[in-house]
C-alpha cells in the first residue's frame, strides 16, 4: 500500500480468482483513544471500533472512503483504491491502446518544435468518475524539470456503438535548449483514477523523435505564362524552431486529382517553391519534415488548381 | 528516405556537400545495423545514449546559431579552444567562434573515426562476420575532415590484447552509431547555417 | 472453491459451427479475464482467445481470427467459444482458463471435426 | 508459431536433477514473466511455477524456476516417479499480450 495523495491510498493486488488479497491497517488520524467506530463509503454499518481497522482487502467492494467517527462526528477519511497486477502485468483498463506507432501505446506525444514544449494525449470509452494527473521528467535517476498542465477532454467521438473520450496536456520542458543533442528521454507518468481502479501509464520519448511540424503556411499557386505549369510556393510554419537555416525543413509537394485512385505527382525539396503541372480538378498539397532527422510529416496543406 | 537529392552549387560553403553525405551515410549504417543487428538491443528505445565526446569537444555550444545565444539554457558550458582555421572557412570575416565551431566539429570526427576503425578492427575477426562498418561512410568522415582541413595531432588507433567480446562490440556499435548520428545531424543543421551566412 | 465446468464439444463437420461453454463457480467471474486454450492431440497447448473482465476487448490467434468468437455472459456466469466454418485442423481438447499469476482450468473437451 | 523453444524430451533416474530450458527473445522472457505447468496424460495443465521462481502452495519444494535475460528453466532436484510428464514453459509478448505464448513442451521421462 502506498500514498497517491493526502489520504488517498493505493492497494496493489496480485488480481486473480481466489487470492488472498492484502491486509491493510487503517490509523484513524485524532489524539482520541476511545469510543472510535469505523464504517465504508455511505453505509453506516460498523465495521470495527478503535483507533486502528485491520480489513482483508481482495475485491473492488472492499476498496473505497473509510472514515472513523467518534459520536457522530467524523474524524477522518481513507480512500482506498485498487491497482490491479495480472499474472505480472499490470493492468490497462482505463485507457484504449491507440495500437500506433505499435501495440501497447497507450498515451502518444507530439512536438510542433525544439522549444521544449510537447502535447500527449490518450483515448478511453469511460465517462464518468474519471480523473488524470500528469507528472514529466527528464530522465529518471536524477529527473529534470517538465511542467505539465492539467489534463482536459479534448474531443469526443462516436466509434461503432461506442462513444470514444480524447484527453490531452501541454508540458514544457523547464530549459530547453533547442539546438541541444537530447542524451535523456523525457518520462511521462499518467496517473488514470476511475471510481475505485487506479492505474499508471507511462511513455518514454526524444523530443526530436515525435517532432511533427505544423504544415507549411501561406500556400499560393503563380501560373506560369504560356504553360500548364504552376510555381507552387509556401512559408515556415509559424510554429517551428528559429532560424530556419540551422533547423531547416524539406518538403513534399503532390498534386492529387480528384478521385483517390489517380496516380498523385510528388515532388521533393528543400526549398519553398516548387513548379508542378497543375491538372483540371486536382489540388495541389505540401507537407513539412525535419530536413535532417526523419521523424512525422506534418499535415497537408492544400489549394485547389483551378 | 531516399529522395531526390540537388548536387550543391561550386560556389556553396565547401563543407555543406560533405556533411549532408556525412549523414545519409551514417543514416544507412544505422539502419544496416538495426536490421543486422535485430537479436541485439540496437533500437533508440534500448540503447543507453552516450557520447564519446562528451567533455572533449562542445560543438553544440560552440556552433550555437547567433539566434539562439540569448536563450541561456543553450550557453550552460560553453569551454572550447581554439585552433586556427581551416579550408571551410571561405572568408575573412569568419568569426573566432566560427573558426572554434569548425574546430570543434574536426576533433568530433577524428574521435569518431578511431573508436569506429578499432571497432571495424574487432567486428573483422568475429566467426559470424555477421556486421562490418561501411567504408563509404568512413571515406565520407575522411572526405569532411579533409575538407575542413584543421591541424591537429593524429590520434593513434586504440589497441586492445584481450579477446574481443563481440556481443559487447556489436552492442558498443549500435550506441555509436545512434550517437554519430545525431552528431551528424547538428553538424548538417550547422553547415546548412552556415552556408545561409 | 473455483470451478469452471465446460461443455459443448462433440464431432462435427468441416465447415459447420459448433459452440463451447465454461462455467464458472466459486469467485467473482465479472471481475476477471478468460482464455481459451487448445491442444491437438499428441501436440503442445495453443493459446486462442481471450476475453477482458467486462467483454470490452477481445483477442484472437491468427489461426482463429475472423472464424472463432469469444464472448461472456456475466449474468450467468459463462463464457463461450462460437466456433465457425471449423476445419480439421481445428481438432483438439479445448480448455477455458481464467487470467491471472495463478490460474484454474476448466476439464477440457474435446472437438473433433472430421467428414 | 512457437516462440518459446523448449528440448523435446530429458530424462533421470529417481533422485536426480533434472533441468528444463525455456528460451525466447527479448520482447517476450526478456520482458515478462515466466509460468511452468506440468501436464500428466489426459489431464488438463498444472501451474508449478509463477512469476519466474515463486511456487504455488500444494507445489512439493523440489521444483524451482529461474530466469536469466531471454531465457528461463524449470528444475526437478530428486526426480520422482510420478513426475514424469509433460512440461510447458508460458510468457508473454509485450506487443501482443494478453495472448499466451507457450513453450513447444518437453516430456520428462524417469527411467528404471
Known amino acids: 500500500i502506498w500514498e497517491l495523495k493526502k489520504d488517498v491510498y493505493v492497494v496493489e493486488l496480485d488480481w486473480y480468482p481466489d487470492a488472498p488479497g492484502e491486509m491493510v491497517v487503517l490509523t484513524c488520524d485524532t489524539p482520541e483513544e476511545d469510543g472510535i467506530t469505523w464504517t465504508l463509503d455511505q453505509s453506516s454499518e460498523v465495521l470495527g471500533s478503535g483507533k486502528t481497522l485491520t480489513i482483508q482487502v481482495k475485491e473492488f467492494g472492499d476498496a473505497g472512503q473509510y472514515t472513523c467517527h467518534k459520536g457522530g462526528e467524523v474524524l477522518s477519511h481513507s480512500l482506498l483504491l485498487l491497482h490491479k497486477k495480472e499474472d505480472g502485468i499490470w493492468s490497462t483498463d482505463i485507457l484504449k491502446d491507440q495500437k500506433e506507432p505499435k501495440n501497447k501505446t497507450f498515451l502518444r506525444c507530439e512536438a510542433k518544435n525544439y522549444s521544449g514544449r510537447f502535447t500527449c494525449w490518450w483515448l478511453t470509452t469511460i465517462s464518468t468518475d474519471l480523473t488524470f494527473s500528469v507528472k514529466s521528467s527528464r530522465g529518471s535517476s536524477d529527473p529534470q524539470g517538465v511542467t505539465c498542465g492539467a489534463a482536459t477532454l479534448s474531443a469526443e467521438r462516436v466509434r461503432g456503438d461506442n462513444k470514444e473520450y480524447e484527453y490531452s496536456v501541454e508540458c514544457q520542458e523547464d530549459s530547453a535548449c533547442p539546438a541541444a543533442e537530447e542524451s535523456l528521454p523525457i518520462e511521462v507518468m499518467v496517473d488514470a483514477v476511475h471510481k475505485l481502479k487506479y492505474e499508471n501509464y507511462t511513455s518514454s520519448f526524444f523530443i526530436r523523435d515525435i517532432i511533427k511540424p505544423d504544415p507549411p503556411k501561406n500556400l499560393q499557386l503563380k501560373p506560369l505564362k504560356n504553360s500548364r505549369q504552376v510555381e507552387v510556393s509556401w512559408e515556415y510554419p509559424d510554429t517551428w524552431s528559429t532560424p530556419h537555416s540551422y533547423f531547416s525543413l524539406t518538403f513534399c509537394v503532390q498534386v492529387q486529382g480528384k478521385s483517390k485512385r489517380e496516380k498523385k505527382d510528388r515532388v521533393f525539396t528543400d526549398k519553398t517553391s516548387a513548379t508542378v503541372i497543375c491538372r483540371k480538378n486536382a489540388s495541389i498539397s505540401v507537407r513539412a519534415q525535419d530536413r535532417y532527422y526523419s521523424s512525422s510529416w506534418s499535415e497537408w496543406a492544400s489549394v485547389p488548381c483551378s | 528516405r531516399n529522395l531526390p537529392v540537388a548536387t550543391p552549387d561550386p560556389g556553396m560553403f565547401p563543407c555543406l556537400h560533405h556533411s549532408q553525405n556525412l549523414l545519409r551515410a551514417v543514416s544507412n549504417m544505422l539502419q544496416k545495423a538495426r536490421q543486422t543487428l535485430e537479436f541485439y538491443p540496437c533500437t533508440s528505445e534500448e540503447i543507453d545514449h552516450e557520447d564519446i565526446t562528451k567533455d572533449k569537444t562542445s560543438t553544440v555550444e560552440a556552433c550555437l546559431p547567433l539566434e539562439l545565444t540569448k536563450n541561456e539554457s543553450c550557453l550552460n558550458s560553453r569551454e572550447t579552444s581554439f585552433i586556427t582555421n581551416g579550408s571551410c572557412l571561405a572568408s575573412r570575416k569568419t568569426s573566432f567562434m566560427m573558426a572554434l565551431c569548425l574546430s570543434s566539429i574536426y576533433e568530433d570526427l577524428k574521435m569518431y573515426q578511431v573508436e569506429f576503425k578499432t571497432m571495424n578492427a574487432k567486428l573483422l575477426m568475429d566467426p559470424k562476420r555477421q556486421i562490418f562498418l561501411d567504408q563509404n561512410m568512413l571515406a565520407v568522415i575522411d572526405e569532411l575532415m579533409q575538407a575542413l582541413n584543421f591541424n591537429s595531432e593524429t590520434v593513434p588507433q586504440k589497441s586492445s590484447l584481450e579477446e574481443p567480446d563481440f556481443y559487447k562490440t556489436k552492442i558498443k556499435l549500435c550506441i555509436l552509431l545512434h550517437a554519430f548520428r545525431i552528431r551528424a545531424v547538428t553538424i548538417d543543421r550547422v553547415m546548412s547555417y552556415l552556408n545561409a551566412s | 472453491q473455483v470451478q469452471l465446468v465446460q461443455s459443448g464439444g462433440g464431432v462435427v463437420q468441416p465447415g459447420r459451427s459448433l459452440r463451447l461453454s465454461c462455467a464458472a463457480s466459486g469467485f467473482t467471474f465479472s471481475s476477471y479475464g478468460m482464455h481459451w486454450v487448445r491442444q491437438a492431440p499428441g501436440k503442445g497447448l495453443e493459446w486462442v482467445a481471450f476475453?477482458?473482465?467486462?467483454?470490452?476487448?477481445?483477442y484472437y490467434a491468427d489461426s482463429v481470427k475472423g472464424r472463432f468468437t469469444i464472448s461472456r455472459d456475466n449474468s450467468k456466469n459463462t463464457l463461450y467459444l462460437q466456433m465457425k466454418s471449423l476445419r480439421a485442423e481445428d481438432t483438439a481438447v479445448y480448455y477455458c482458463?481464467?487470467?491471472?499469476?495463478?490460474?484454474?482450468w476448466g476439464q477440457g473437451t474435446m472437438v473433433t471435426v472430421s467428414s | 508459431s512457437y516462440v518459446l523453444t523448449q528440448p523435446p524430451s530429458v530424462s533421470g533416474t529417481p533422485g536426480q536433477r533434472v533441468t528444463i530450458s525455456c528460451s525466447g527473445g527479448r520482447s517476450n522472457i526478456g520482458s515478462n514473466t515466466v509460468k511452468w505447468y506440468q501436464q500428466l496424460p489426459g489431464t488438463a495443465p498444472k501451474l508449478l511455477i509463477y512469476g519466474n521462481d515463486r511456487r504455488p502452495s500444494g507445489v512439493p519444494d523440489r521444483f524451482s524456476g529461474s530466469k536469466s535475460g531471454t531465457s528461463a528453466s524449470l528444475a526437478i532436484t530428486g526426480v520422482q516417479a510420478e513426475d514424469e510428464a509433460d512440461y510447458y514453459c508460458?510468457?508473454?509478448?509485450?506487443?501482443?499480450?494478453?495472448?499466451?505464448?507457450f513453450g513447444t513442451g518437453t516430456k520428462v521421462t524417469v527411467l528404471g
Open positions: 508460458q510468457s508473454y509478448d509485450r506487443g501482443t499480450h494478453p495472448a499466451l505464448l
Open positions: 482458463k481464467t487470467h491471472g499469476s495463478h490460474d484454474n
Open positions: 476475453i477482458r473482465y467486462d467483454g470490452s476487448n477481445k
